[in-house]
Amino acid sequence: DTQEKEVRAMVGSDVELSCACPEGSRFDLNDVYVYWQTSESKTVVTYHIPQNSSLENVDSRYRNRALMSPAGMLRGDFSLRLFNVTPQDEQKFHCLVLSQSLGFQEVLSVEVTLHVAANFSVPVVSAPHSPSQDELTFTCTSINGYPRPNVYWINKTDNSLLDQALQNDTVFLNMRGLYDVVSVLRIARTPSVNIGCCIENVLLQQNLTVGSQTGNDIGERDKITENPVSTGEKNAATWS
């Protein structure tokens, strides 16, 4: 039966995808055939075939970026070291080990789901402008994050969430495969408005909040909250 595992990694980091037999196992590298593939498209990530050093079957996206340790394989550790993780690496990987002395029977099958994350930049909230006499518009921008973010606007006076119908979010996938987000908030003009923009990265359980005020010159400091304690309201509402 195939074992199933999950692992998380930051964009640009290196990660180990675990695939190992119980401790104390010994393997002959002239006997085992080891394959790492992506589970869906069956893209070849790397492999070991006895007496064959060529890796011509490896997909160009993984060439020189995915390695197994020969010393590890001898003791039954067929884990994959994946270097410089990219957003495109967020998928399921399948490790398969066959023994030729057992008639090419599978001796190990492991599926590892890789979740990829990247921190969003601290949001930048533009100074409010007035498209009309009775309306204020704020723009919040944050870039280079992963996965796709959630954006919330907060009334900083009581830390309540503003109605999401008031905001218009545009999320772009940039050249690096990371997400950029621009959120435009339109609210009724009042004498003094104290609002905040919150960018939530669900995978990292991280929220970045920046405030903006009208009616005075005091700017709210940027805040980052990780692994918050839930308050019963929507998580992003009270990260300050």
Epitope: Y33, Q37, K42, V44, Y47, P50, L96, L98, F104, S109
Partner: antibody
Framework: EVQLVESGGGLVQPGGSLRLSCVGS????????MSWVRQAPGKGLEWVAY????????YYVDSVKGRFTISRDNAKNSLYLQMNSLRAEDTAVYYC??????????????WGQGILVTVSS | DIQMTQSPSSLSASVGDRVTITCRAS??????LAWYQQKPEKAPKSLIY???SLQSGVPSRFSGSGSGTDFTLTISSLQPEDFATYYC?????????FGQGTKVEIK
Amino acid sequence: EVQLVESGGGLVQPGGSLRLSCVGSGFTFSSYWMSWVRQAPGKGLEWVAYIKQDGSEKYYVDSVKGRFTISRDNAKNSLYLQMNSLRAEDTAVYYCARDGILWFGDIPTYWGQGILVTVSS
Amino acid sequence: DIQMTQSPSSLSASVGDRVTITCRASQGISNWLAWYQQKPEKAPKSLIYTASSLQSGVPSRFSGSGSGTDFTLTISSLQPEDFATYYCQQYNSYPRTFGQGTKVEIK
């Protein structure tokens, strides 16, 4: 233990259709290329059709192109061969085979026991 | 497709004889060659893979050699149960193609 069990063979009239099925067990079916190989009475082995792991690539011997369709259902560990417009020369034992994982050489073919298809009026 | 040419197409031999069958590929296939034995009404049985590796459970009187385009299957001392048809198959690339077979008969 690796097992491949074919079904769906039998006697069919020329111009008729038949659908062969093969169920694999004892291995991770979705990780391997699979194929159908046939052997006419008293003749040698002839590959008929190949299919990649995810079904995205298929290859057919010239003599069956346009008449036979290979497909697979990885959720059911099953391989299929839909045979239409059958001819007398398609009479053969049809073997389901587990092939390799890579495009270029890796592991040898593993064979099912075969099933007889007879095309005759 | 890679063409596989086997010779001879048939041979007669006696128990105890040394038998050699050759297989030639139309282009280089490194050592990605398998040999199969087939008896009437049976599926092919794997004997040799990667040109020279003996499948587990196969008697040591069977051996394979060769690389590139020319390959040989040798039965060092023919036994009564060895009378069968032998096929080579390249698995360097798809489609995996076969030789036409060599029938080993009793003299």
